[in-house]
Interface confidence: low
């Protein structure tokens, strides 16, 4: 689709005569008829296949035609076409004399023609005007012409339709050849695809307008390149959405179970070695000179009873010193000068001669030890109680007193909070990470179902015959107080008509 434009510039008819040679009276009031048609080697009459246009009277005899001086018919004259411009044309321009105001062909005398020119040739679409001048015996016409495309049509033949737009269907302007030129921030064949924020992750991000980066489910961050871990993930990370990969030392679905109490809490003091022994439990191995669950207590060097055979220990700045009883010597009073004849075995120990009586050995009863059975056995020295349990000597054996939440011979078992049946009145107990929860039966409430919630047993009107109903709050049952003439647990039987029983 395009327009053939014809710009009339000057018409010269100095003698003011018609084509027949007859003069116009009083002068040649001149208008033009233009016929545009397909290329003909010899321009001949026939339909104006590309269009026609007429002007009003533009002047008398000789005159210059100013731009837009033609009133209703603009100058340049417009001959629109709705097809692909073929690149060739034929053009006929006729100058006519109008004796009156009616310019219709049938209203003019047949000899009103002043001049007629016909040209044909090639013409490419373009903005440049082609100037031409045609001269006959008596007249001269100067004019220029060109072909341009209509709005929204482009290309060598005005055949490419392109209408700039900035909406859901595209965001572009049109190039001179009719190709689309996307507006900034848009791409794609029809410029419908926004260009997302630079760096926005190709798979995990998207955008609905330029320079935006919207994250798909499971992703976050300015560029949608950070995954969102599982909701509630405490000490964990993710490499794909909704994961919870635990950091070292943590476990459980949400990585909230401490598997490395030693590292996270450093409970052991005074250089003791810490060993993890399960979730939230640990054991401290104390360095010499320290004791306690966390090796927090400093030992006197004499606390380990280094002196044997009843020797007494004295603390010194650089260690300790044993004062040996008669008959013993050595750093720890370990050497004896006694024999069985001296009854060296204490606490009911039996003496056995060795090396032909030059030496002896004591066989100690239970609970005693030492070369002379002088020491009571301390079964707690190996710190056998786990999870901070306290070790107690009990006669021939030992026992562990466990911290709350632990049980077993060595406090090695984690107690379920529900094990002691804390829920009253038949409530159901649920172990939670930080305690327990009771689900109470009807009629009870409170954290341990310890509060009785009154159930109005009379609400269902169980008593008949206008009996008065009372609720027994201790049993949540009802009692019917019968009016005169009725008996039964619900006052359902008239007196004198006992219920019929099957026996």
């Amino acid at each position: 689709s395009g327009v053939f434009q014809l710009q009339l510039q000057e018409f010269i008819n100095e003698r003011g005569v018609l084509a027949s040679g007859r003069p116009c009276e009083p002068g040649c009031r001149t208008f033009f008829r233009v016929c545009l048609k397909h290329f003909q080697a010899v321009v001949s009459p026939g339909p104006c296949t590309f269009g026609t246009v007429s002007t009003p009277v533009l002047g008398t005899n000789s005159f210059a035609v100013r731009d837009d001086s033609s009133g209703g018919g603009r100058n340049p004259l417009q001959l629109p076409f709705n097809f692909t411009w073929p690149g060739t044309f034929s053009l006929i321009i006729e100058a006519w004399h109008a004796p009156g105001d009616d310019l219709r062909p049938e209203a003019l005398p047949p000899d009103a023609l002043i001049s007629k020119i016909a040209i044909q040739g090639s013409l490419a679409v373009g903005q440049n005007w082609l100037l031409d001048e045609q001269t006959s015996t008596l007249t001269r016409l100067r004019y220029s012409y060109r072909v341009i495309c209509s709005d929204n049509y482009y290309g060598d033949n005005c055949s490419r339709l392109c209408k700039k737009r900035n909406d859901h269907f595209g965001h572009y302007v049109c190039q001179p050849d009719g190709n689309l030129s996307c507006l900034p921030g848009w791409t794609g064949e029809y410029c419908q695809q926004p260009i997302c924020l630079s760096g926005c992750h190709e798979q995990n991000g998207y955008c609905s307008k330029p320079a935006e980066c919207l994250c798909r489910p499971g992703w976050q961050g300015r560029l949608c390149n950070e995954c969102i871990p599982h909701n509630g993930c405490r000490h964990g990370t993710c490499s794909t959405p909704w994961q919870c990969t635990c950091d070292e030392g943590w476990g459980g679905l949400f990585c909230d179970q401490d598997l490395n109490y030693c590292t996270h809490h450093s409970p052991c003091k005074n250089g003791a070695t810490c060993s993890n022994s399960g979730q939230r439990s640990y054991t401290c191995t104390c360095r010499p000179g320290y004791t306690g669950v966390d090796c927090e207590l400093e030992l006197s060097e004499c606390d380990s009873n280094p002196c044997r055979n009843g020797g007494s220990c004295k603390d010194q700045e650089d260690g300790y010193h044993c004062l040996c009883p008669p008959g013993y010597y050595g750093l720890h009073c370990e050497h004896s000068t006694l024999s069985c004849a001296d009854s060296p075995c204490f606490n009911g120990g039996s003496c056995r001669e060795r090396n032909q009586g030059a030496n002896y050995a004591c066989e100690c009863p239970p609970n005693f030890t030492g070369s002379n059975c002088e020491k009571k056995v301390d079964r707690c020295t190996s710190n056998p109680c786990a999870n901070g349990g306290q070790c107690l000597n009990r006669g021939p054996s030992r026992m562990c007193r466990c911290r709350p939440g632990f049980t077993g011979t060595y406090c090695e078992l984690h107690v379920s909070d529900c094990a002691r049946n804390p829920c009253a009145h038949g409530g159901t107990c649920h172990d939670l990470e930080n305690g327990l929860m009771c689900t109470c039966p009807a009629g009870f409430s409170g954290r341990r179902c310890e509060v009785r919630t009154s159930i109005d047993a009379c609400a269902s009107s169980p008593c008949f015959n206008r009996a008065t109903c009372y609720t027994d709050l201790s049993t949540d049952t009802f009692v019917c107080n019968c009016p005169y003439g009725f008996v039964g647990s619900r006052c359902e039987f008239p007196v004198g008509l006992p219920p019929s029983f099957p026996w």
Epitope: N152, L161, K163, D167, H168, F169, E189, Y190
Partner: antibody, heavy 119, light 108 residues
């Protein structure tokens, strides 16, 4: 003269697929789109989607997205619409129409293809 | 989804009457994207008006369209016998493209 001629009536069983063709003539096929519209018996018009005969780009109504495919064959200037997993609710006359993406009109329309879905 | 509501649902008129059909959109529609179609029983729809007010090729000048934003109107200045039909408005400004439910113009 611009013409759109559609394929003939079809009877299908529930769960089957149907493929309707629409042959265009009288204009430059790739300068326009083809849109598909259906009309259930006694009901109004319902837009299903359109396809650019120039690029093959499609825009389907969400309602049909999962089970519709529109294609064109520029060598035969024919557009096709395939609808899968048919139910009795898909019984309708299916129309194709030429779509101007500059002026946003549907003109002309094909004569319509009746698709009946029945067990 | 842009919902187009046409009113009235049915009009009973005589040849020569002036007709005004209304089409109201649930949200603003650019006038470039609004069209009107005529459909007669057993026939495919026919384009009457596009761009809210431009008459399609070959459509008589008794048909005219107007409106903008959410309110659009199709006017038939003087009903001819062949104008009794169902009239639909349609938008393609927002996906999905939608039609109104139609207005039936019948002979009184």
């Amino acid at each position: 003269q611009v013409h759109l001629v559609q394929s003939g009536a079809e009877v299908k069983k529930p769960g089957a697929s149907v493929k309707v063709s629409c042959r265009a003539s009288g204009y430059t096929f790739t300068n326009y789109g083809i849109t598909w519209v259906r009309q259930a018996p006694g009901q109004g018009l319902e837009w299903m989607g359109w396809i650019s005969a120039y690029s093959g780009n499609t825009d389907y109504a969400q309602k049909f997205q999962a089970r519709i495919t529109m294609t064109t064959d520029t060598s035969t200037t024919t557009a096709y619409m395939e609808l899968r997993s048919l139910t009795s609710d898909d019984t309708a006359v299916y129309y194709c129409a030429r779509y101007s993406w500059n002026f946003h009109w549907f003109d002309p329309w094909g004569q319509g293809t009746l698709v009946t879905v029945s067990s | 989804e842009i919902v187009l509501t046409q009113s009235p649902g049915t009009l009973s008129l005589s040849p020569g009457d002036r007709v005004t059909l209304s089409c109201r959109a649930s949200q603003s529609v650019s006038s470039s994207y609004l069209a009107w179609y005529q459909q007669k029983p057993g026939q495919a729809p026919r384009l009457l008006i596009y761009g809210a007010s431009s008459r399609a090729t070959g459509i008589p000048d008794r048909f005219s369209g107007s409106g903008s934003g959410t309110d659009f109107t199709l006017t038939i200045s003087s009903l001819e016998p062949e104008d009794f039909a169902v009239y639909y408005c349609q938008q393609c400004g927002g996906s999905p493209w939608t039609f109104g439910q139609g207005t039936r113009v019948e002979i009184k």
